[in-house]
Interface confidence: low
């Protein structure tokens, strides 16, 4: 039977009284419009809530916004609208919260049509006080903080100027005109594209890529014929137009654009796109769209330089540019990613990789579930996960998959069990081992969140009717208790808990509706008294991640090392606490063929660990472009997976020889790049 409140479930004692004493209601003195919520800092308890309400008048729309602040994780709120002079705040810019624990907040105000520039309100004390600043430009984008220094801000203006502030928005300087896109890199570097003839859209494919490392004192052109650019991990990518036609190629740099190499990826045409699905300092997952309006493409994984790519997954579901993909990084276990493929019959199936894209498989069928109508064989089927694509298709899926780095091994997702994703109402499934095995956790769609590093899971049923019940589990979703948090049901709009899953507080947001008005309301529930004591050593057990065969000496080896974690026992009802740190012990593994990707020109046949030569490249010299020189690759088909720490064992030979020939790349070679100073 599905897990629930059966005899095996140990009930949490007196939980109703404990939760009732820790349930805090706040009714907002607002007409219902839109509400946005931001956490300011980590473990500060500070929440800002911005409510906005538009009153459509005959000629124009009149707007009103209110700002509220809590410093106790949402239990109490104070109206601080007067701190921003009762100004209407533009919700499309949201609340720009500073990095780390800087305590900085920027709100962008709505200003009247004829004004010279925009207006912002700035706080650097966790929104206790705000300073009004009038801008010398109208912002087009939200203020962007430098990741290294929260005093440095950049913004684009409606006239495509690039503006920079070095004193947290007090004073602004336009450092460049005709800018399309700007991004902070590392070390306070700014990368941006510029157009020459008229507009960003008109010059797409003829843009220039620029860099400034001194906030606009001097500039360097690092690329021409640019279509777009992106940053991922330590890699800088640019999609560059080819000389002869309308195709584009990806070029990559690992030195901030000083030198570039052409990525060994297929070129794309006008209607196609590239997308960086995930990137870290070791490698990149790149999606390359198929020609035509297919809705799918191919995932490639890079080597440690971002240059040589291996085909990772075919028929990867990704609708048009900026569209939907289900690609999900499972942050609760190293090396695990989930995504969807579009099969030949146009059904959508979920695939999972446990080794950072080396091999993909279907998700194992949950033991407590039956195969649905999509399954040809009622005894053999898989779990299929609903993610962004299902949500975009308006299926009854309120939330994407959820995992948290400090809730080791836990993955929660909506899904269906069959041969493909079903349009039927989904159930909620949980994995406690990073996606290897799954169990049905809740019947029907729910909102869910993880508290206390996995010590508590909270869920609320997704319903069109008003609700007043919350469910919670202290044993990773095996057993559930229900708590009625209010006598009067509310129209539920969202669950909010502090990012990072360390908190024991959950806020339930919604609105009440009466004949005349509707008002925003929040209920914040603190679970601290449910988890009465702090966890001790006896509450934890040793767990070997990625373990599939305990008899095997190499069991648990993924990317060259295995990790043992201390994990909370399901039967322990105790607090991990805000200071909980994941305890893990890694150990290096001997290298096997699993620690190698197939090199350029090679592929891995299904269910085989050996790499074989691609038929179309057999007998050809493998030549590729590196830093503008042509290289000759002598390989027996393998290259070490980026980030793989294995030592010894099998280690196939691979060599790269410089052919001392120039590549035929139309990209700027380093010697042609120019610099200039302001």
């Amino acid at each position: 039977s599905a897990p629930g409140e059966d005899e095996e479930c140990g009930r949490v004692r007196d939980f109703v009284a404990k939760l009732a004493n820790n349930t805090h209601q706040h009714v907002f003195d607002d007409l219902r419009g839109s509400v946005s919520l931001s956490w300011v800092g980590d473990s500060t308890g500070v929440i800002l809530v911005l409510t906005t309400f538009h009153v459509p008048l005959v000629i124009m729309t009149f707007g009103q916004s209110k700002l509220y602040r809590s410093e106790d994780y949402g239990k109490n709120f104070k109206d601080i609208t007067d701190l921003i002079n009762n100004t209407f705040i533009r919700t499309e810019f949201g609340m720009a919260i500073g990095p780390e624990n800087s305590g900085k907040v920027v709100l962008t105000a709505e200003v009247s049509g004829g004004s010279r520039g925009g207006r912002i309100f700035r706080s650097s004390d966790f929104a206790k006080n705000f300073v009004q600043t009038d801008l010398p430009f109208h912002p087009l984008t939200q203020m962007m903080y430098s990741p290294q220094n929260s005093d440095y801000l950049l913004a684009l203006s409606t006239e495509n100027g690039l503006w920079v502030s070095k004193n947290f928005g007090g004073k602004w300087e336009e450092i460049h005109k005709a800018v399309c896109l700007a991004k902070w890199g590392s070390d306070n570097t700014i990368f941006f594209t510029t157009y020459a003839n008229g507009s960003c859209k008109a010059d797409l494919g003829a843009l220039e890529l620029w860099r400034t490392s001194d906030l606009g004192k001097s500039f360097k052109t690092i690329g021409v014929k640019i279509y777009s650019f992106g940053l991922g991990g330590r890699f800088l990518f640019a999609s560059v137009m080819a000389d002869k036609d309308t195709t584009r190629r990806i070029h990559v740099s690992t030195d901030q654009g000083d030198t570039w190499s052409m990525a060994q990826l297929p070129s794309v045409g006008q209607e196609q796109f590239y997308s960086i699905l995930a990137a870290n300092d070791d490698m990149v997952f790149m999606h390359v769209d198929e020609p035509g309006d297919t809705g799918f493409g191919t995932i490639f994984t890079s080597d440690d330089r971002g240059i040589v790519y291996s085909k990772s997954l075919d028929r990867h579901l990704y609708t048009t540019t900026g569209g939907e993909t289900d690609f999900t990084n499972v942050t609760s276990l190293r090396g695990v990613y989930i995504t969807s493929v579009l099969s030949e019959d146009n059904s959508i199936q979920t695939m999972i990789t446990f080794d950072q894209g080396g091999r993909w498989t279907h998700l194992r069928k949950p033991e407590n579930s039956e195969c649905d109508a999509t399954a040809k064989n009622k005894n053999e089927c898989s779990l299929h996960i609903h993610a962004s694509y299902s949500i975009s298709q308006k299926l009854n899926v309120p939330m994407a998959p959820l995992s948290e780095p400090n809730a080791v091994g836990i993955v929660i997702a909506h899904g269906s069990v069959g041969d493909a994703i079903s349009v039927m109402v989904p159930d909620v499934y949980i994995s406690d081992d990073g996606g290897y095995s799954w169990t049905k956790m809740l019947e029907g769609p729910h909102y869910y969140t993880i508290l206390d590093s996995g010590g508590i899971i909270v869920a609320i049923e997704h319903s069109s009717r008003p609700i007043n019940v919350i469910k919670f589990s202290t044993d990773e979703g095996q057993c559930w208790q229900t708590y009625t948090f209010t006598r009067d049901p509310i129209y539920f709009t969202g669950l909010a808990s502090e990012p990072g899953a360390r908190s024991m507080n959950i806020s339930i947001w919604g609105f009440t509706e009466s004949f005349l008005t509707s008002q925003w309301v929040s209920y914040t529930i603190d679970f601290k008294d449910i988890l009465e004591r702090n966890c001790e050593e006896k509450d934890y057990t040793i767990w070997l991640a990625h373990s599939t065969d305990p008899e095997d000496y190499e069991d648990g080896c993924i990317l060259g090392y295995k990790e043992q974690f201390l994990r909370l026992r399901k039967s322990s009802v105790c607090q991990n606490g805000r200071d909980y740190v994941v305890t893990k012990q890694p150990s290096i593994c001997l290298c096997s063929l699993e620690d190698f990707l197939c090199d350029f020109g090679y592929y891995r046949p299904e269910n085989d660990s050996k790499c074989v030569e691609q038929p179309e490249l057999k007998g050809h010299d493998l030549e590729f472009c590196l830093y503008g020189r042509e290289e000759h690759l002598t390989t027996n088909g393998y290259r070490k997976i980026p980030g793989d720490k294995c030592q010894g064992g099998v280690n196939p030979v691979r060599e790269v020889k410089d052919l001392k020939k120039k590549c035929t790349s139309n990209f700027l070679s380093p010697e042609k790049q120019n610099s200039k100073s302001n």
Epitope: Q585, S587, G648, N651, V653, E655
Partner: antibody, heavy 117, light 108 residues
Framework: EVQLVESGGGLVQPGGSLRLSCAAS????????MSWVRQAPGKGLEWVAT????????YYPDILKGRFTISRDNAKNSLYLQMNSGRAEDTAVYYC??????????WGQGTLVTVSS | DIQMTQSPSSLSASVGDRVTITCRVS??????LAWYQQKPGKAPKLLVY???NLADGVPSRFSGSGSGTDYTLTINSLQPEDFATYYC??????????FGQGTKLEIK
């Protein structure tokens, strides 16, 4: 039986160069990382260099980078250490060792290098 | 770089004694540590790898223990052939894979 035999040691002038060799037998040479370790007279062991099985990856301590170069020829089952700009403090017995991962499991008998005028 | 502090630097003991040599590391190396034995004029010999595993052919009177930053090599019931110098070496992460400074075990 695993065997590692170093050669090429001897007397070299300060600023001079020397190339050490290590002949391997009794195991599949091209699937193992290999290392050089040295020991100055009366002193402890000092790691000098490591090379991956295919020869692609090389590692050195910072103080030796640029002066020492480790290389291998898998066809000849041989490991090499090229020493340039010799200094008195390079005087030591140099050992080659098989390096399968978390240890150096087999060592040669060593070859003595003396840097002196 | 990871620093290795081996102690004691020298030690006198008698045949049949139980001897302990410790190696303290400047950061957690997650048991990626090896112990070697070296006799005068000879090459080092691997005794223990991964902190606790005996290498092939090493007598069971040798044992390794420890985790995190503190590791120990123990010799139960010293034999005459055990008098030598012992070194620890870490293999965690990227190089340099430093050795400890050595412990000379002498006959009392």
């Amino acid at each position: 039986e695993v065997q590692l035999v170093e050669s090429g040691g001897g007397l070299v002038q300060p600023g001079g160069s020397l190339r050490l060799s290590c002949a391997a037998s009794g195991f599949t040479f091209n699937i193992y990382g290999m290392s050089w370790v040295r020991q100055a007279p009366g002193k402890g062991l000092e790691w000098v260099a490591t090379i991956s099985s295919g020869g692609i990856y090389t590692y050195y301590p910072d103080i030796l980078k640029g002066r020492f170069t480790i290389s291998r020829d898998n066809a000849k089952n041989s490991l090499y250490l090229q020493m340039n700009s010799g200094r008195a403090e390079d005087t030591a017995v140099y050992y080659c060792a098989r390096h399968p991962g978390g240890a150096m499991d087999y060592w040669g008998q060593g070859t003595l290098v003396t840097v002196s005028s | 770089d990871i620093q290795m502090t081996q102690s004691p630097s020298s030690l006198s003991a008698s045949v049949g004694d139980r001897v302990t040599i410790t190696c303290r590391v400047s950061e957690n190396i997650y048991s990626n540590l090896a112990w070697y034995q070296q006799k005068p004029g000879k090459a080092p010999k691997l005794l223990v790898y991964a902190a606790t595993n005996l290498a092939d052919g090493v007598p069971s009177r040798f044992s390794g223990s420890g985790s995190g930053t503190d590791y120990t090599l123990t010799i139960n019931s010293l034999q005459p052939e055990d008098f030598a110098t012992y070194y620890c070496q870490h293999f965690w992460g990227t190089p340099p894979w430093t050795f400890g400074q050595g412990t000379k075990l002498e006959i009392k």
